[in-house]
């Protein structure tokens, strides 16, 4: 299953499959997730070790048992790959690292005014993988405001150095934010020239393209089909690059297929997994396990659930079957691709779905009336769980925010439905940033069911929580995916990095905003919050957030939207924007419904499939 917990001051002993330099544990975890063999990782921050060569070291590890012995190491951070973690799987990494220089091949230098501009340049450059920016206070005047675009053979820095007034980060191409755009075309009977960066076996050109997309240095590819004249080169997928970023030449060639990486696509990237099943094909590799199962789909599920399994073959040979069940061969290799592909067999083969973002249909959990005042504009994909709840009567308008928590589920505030309980009037927009982008052709979700907490009463602040079941499930993308819910009764976690988002008023007597706003707000203890509200009871089912001096807060139109906190590199939905005394008033924190206190209710309502246990929409 999905294991998200991090282990502080711990280092996994043995099992090394790769090592690299990464700026933090979260990036190390992401590299582990995308490495075909990595199940566990250990990271050494600069503060944890004196050996300069091992600082920022990220060690990727494998283990037959799925675990390794942990040894105490002060400052070290260890954890698990996020394979099998559904929508949490993403190669997108937005963080900017201050005081850190990520080294690599510097291939472009320009003057820019901010680190954000530098990151944008990197994202819009086909070869740039990461960058460093010298701030205006950098000690050498001639380097100030320099933006260095970089790459390396492995896509990660060749070294990372602590350096004042330097800021570094990664390209946002994996966030589907590149302005370059991509070539979706597949070119039949055409071979590209240039430098081969890797060679793998794939059953078709589409798998080859997805592998190219997620390979750090692949810009385009050529695939040799299973009828290619040279037998030893059949099903070979050649991942390629060039100085210019495009093929310098192409040759007409029977039984070859060529195409481009889709990493520069804007708004949609392919999933980092291959779901197709190939009948009459055997995939060869190292045997992990053999099990009897009923049908090829069950074989794929079995492979997906066994975290080390990379691909499988389901044999229909009479000697491999008994009754309705046949042998399911679970396999792996060094690079995650079959070591041999055979056609015309009595088997069916395919890949593990452990890296698919879709995950299962349930809500996301983890093991462990009120624009934003004083906020700033959000950027694409920054808050992919944020939805806009809009009402269409004569005109259409934004009324509330909400949070996507599953393919078919949105969590919001109950008071959003005060006086508007009819599901037909509501339209739910997801994966949007600007309300002005919504036209009559913009797709929206309709409501199948509104489930208001049974103890909620109109015009009262208690139990201000509601679930919306959508008529049709949503697909996950970099711009539309769920937020994880906290653990039940999560009281021990101290959240220090919390944000509220929404399109609500920018002042008490204001208007709905066009661009999704964000504001960083500290949590306030319930005891402190209670003292600020002389005539309202702040219960343990509420959480408060705000600045003593005011100035930053949620406001009208933000209701129902998320209060999210980042902990151990993972965002969690801590609160639902509920109520407050005015907006951003001095000494008056905003009050949010505490999601952890409603976990039983959320899980009960989202998991009761027959609907009998679900509360009906209010009449």
């Amino acid at each position: 299953g999905c294991l998200t917990q991090l282990y502080e001051n711990a280092f996994f002993r043995g099992g090394d499959v790769a090592s690299m330099y990464t700026p933090n544990a979260q990036y190390c975890q992401m590299r582990c997730t995308f490495h075909p063999r990595c199940l566990l990782f250990s990271f050494l921050p600069a503060s944890s070790i004196n050996d300069m060569e091992k600082r920022f070291g990220c060690f990727l590890k494998d283990s037959v048992t799925g675990t390794l012995p942990k040894v105490h190491r002060t400052g070290a951070v260890s954890g698990h790959s996020l394979k099998q973690c559904g929508h949490q799987i993403s190669a997108c990494h937005r963080d900017i690292y201050k005081g850190v220089d990520m080294r690599g091949v510097n291939f472009n230098v320009s003057k820019v005014s901010s680190v954000e501009e530098c990151q944008k340049r990197c994202t819009s450059n086909i070869r740039c993988q990461f960058f460093s920016y010298a701030t205006q206070t950098f000690h050498k005047a001639e380097y100030r405001n320099n933006c260095l675009l970089k790459y390396s053979p492995g896509g990660t820095p060749t070294a990372i150095k602590v350096l004042s007034n330097v800021e570094s980060g990664f390209s946002l191409k994996p966030c589907a934010l590149s302005e370059i755009g991509c070539h979706m075309n597949i070119f039949q009977h055409l071979a590209f020239s240039d430098v081969d960066v890797a060679r793998v076996l794939t059953p078709d050109a589409f798998v080859c393209r997805t592998i190219c997309t997620y390979h750090p240095n692949c810009l385009f590819f050529t695939f040799y089909t299973n009828v290619w004249k040279i037998e030893s080169q059949r099903n070979v997928c050649l991942l390629k690059t060039s100085e210019s970023g495009t093929p310098s030449s192409s040759t007409p060639q029977e039984n070859t297929i060529s195409g481009y990486s889709l990493l520069t696509c804007k708004r949609t990237l392919p999933e980092p997994c291959h779901s197709k099943i190939y009948p009459g094909v055997d995939f060869g590799g190292e045997e992990l396990n053999v099990t009897f199962v009923k049908g090829v789909n069950v074989c794929q599920e079995t492979c997906t659930k066994m975290i080390r399994c990379q691909f499988f073959t389901y044999s229909l040979l009479p000697e491999d079957c008994k009754e309705e069940k046949c042998k399911c061969f679970l396999r792996l290799s060094m690079d995650g691709s079959p070591t041999r592909i055979a056609y015309g067999t009595q088997g069916s083969s395919g890949y593990s779905l452990r890296l698919c973002n879709t995950g299962d249909n349930s809500v996301c959990t983890t093991k462990t009336s009120t624009r934003i005042v004083g906020g700033t504009n959000s950027s694409w994909g920054e808050w992919p769980w944020q939805v806009s709840l809009q009402v269409k009567l004569t005109a259409q308008r934004h009324l509330c925010g909400g949070s996507l928590i599953g393919h078919q589920w949105v969590l919001t505030a109950a008071h959003c439905f005060d006086g508007l309980p009819l599901q037909d009037v509501w339209r739910i927009y997801s994966g949007i940033l600007n309300l002005s982008d919504i036209t009559k052709d913009t797709p929206f979700s309709q409501i199948k069911e509104i489930i208001i907490h049974q103890n909620y009463k109109v015009s009262e602040g208690n139990h201000d929580i509601a679930l919306i079941k959508l008529q049709a499930p949503l697909n996950y993308t970099e711009f539309q995916k769920p937020i994880c819910l906290p653990s039940k009764g999560d009281t021990s976690t101290i959240y220090t990095n919390c944000w509220v988002t929404g399109w609500g008023f920018s002042k008490e007597k204001g208007e709905i905003q066009n661009i999704l706003q964000k504001v960083n707000i500290p949590l306030v203890t319930n005891e402190e919050c209670q003292k600020r509200y002389q005539d309202y009871k702040i219960t343990q089912r509420m959480v408060c957030a705000g600045y003593k001096e005011g100035g930053k807060d949620a406001c009208k139109g933000d209701s129902g939207g998320p209060l999210v906190c980042k902990h151990n590199g993972m965002w969690r939905l801590v609160g639902i924007t509920s109520w407050g005394e005015g907006c951003a008033r001095r000494e008056q924190p905003g009050v949010y419904t505490k999601v952890a206190e409603y976990m039983d209710w959320i899980l009960e309502k989202t998991q009761s499939s027959d609907g009998k246990a679900q509360m009906q929409s209010p009449a």
Epitope: N462, K531, R532, Y533, Q534, D535, K537, I538
Partner: antibody, heavy 116, light 106 residues
Framework: EVQLQQSGAEVVRPGASVKLSCKPS????????MFWLRQRPDQGLEWIGR????????VYDPRFQDRASITAVTSSNTAFLQVNSLTSEDTAVYYC?????????WGQGTLVTVSA | DIQMTQSPSSLSASLGDKITITCKAS??????IAWYQHKPGKGPRLLIH???SLHQDIPSRFSGSGSGRDYSFSISNLEPEDFAIYYC????????FGGGTKVEIK
């Protein structure tokens, strides 16, 4: 409109107990804290204790900890104060009040006279 | 326990006057002070909370200020209905009332 209706005046003997009630209208007691306070003749206001009717949690002024008991029945939307071992010093007007952090709406008071 | 010393215990004033009442806490109460008006036969009425915030529907002639241990409450332009007893209440640590100030017509 928020109102808190308190029970009628009581005359009780020293050493006896008294149980006062407070029935609000216009709100649900479980959505607020309920306070009990008192004012002795020609004296200031004193805080006796507070209850969270939703869960029954109480906080008392240490001076009343052993003799006072605050309860609430959410089904009848009523809060109660019982004071035991009464002496003449307990002669006072007893108030219930709705509160968040502080009492914000008060009842009209119940006069309790302790007299032999 | 936090003690609240309220002064004066009584004062006489005329209609239209401005009066000020003070409360001194035995320790810093972080601005968590409220002021109440009490008239005979009625329950007290909340006027001000958190030092200077007017409770709903309270006229602006009532005001409060202070910090640390020292706080004051004022009524400007006294009106007939303002003659009553006034109490301060600290709520930084549990709840303690001041002794009260009786405001009478001169």
């Amino acid at each position: 409109e928020v109102q808190l209706q308190q029970s009628g005046a009581e005359v009780v003997r020293p050493g006896a107990s008294v149980k006062l009630s407070c029935k609000p209208s216009g709100f649900n007691i479980k959505d607020y804290y309920m306070f009990w306070l008192r004012q002795r003749p020609d004296q200031g206001l004193e805080w006796i204790g507070r209850i969270d009717p939703e869960n029954g949690n109480t906080v008392y002024d240490p001076r009343f900890q052993d003799r006072a008991s605050i309860t609430a029945v959410t089904s009848s939307n009523t809060a109660f104060l019982q004071v035991n071992s009464l002496t003449s010093e307990d002669t006072a007007v007893y108030y219930c009040a709705r509160a968040g952090s502080i009492p914000s709406y008060w009842g009209q008071g119940t006069l309790v006279t302790v007299s032999a | 326990d936090i003690q609240m010393t309220q002064s004066p215990s009584s004062l006489s004033a005329s209609l239209g006057d401005k009066i000020t009442i003070t409360c001194k806490a035995s320790q810093d109460i972080n601005k968590y002070i409220a002021w109440y008006q009490h008239k005979p036969g009625k329950g007290p009425r909340l006027l001000i909370h958190y030092t200077s915030s007017l409770h709903q529907d309270i006229p602006s002639r009532f005001s409060g200020s202070g910090s640390g241990r020292d706080y004051s409450f004022s009524i400007s332009n006294l009106e007939p209905e303002d003659f009553a007893i006034y109490y301060c209440l600290q709520y930084d640590d549990l709840w303690t009332f001041g002794g009260g100030t009786k405001v009478e017509i001169k």
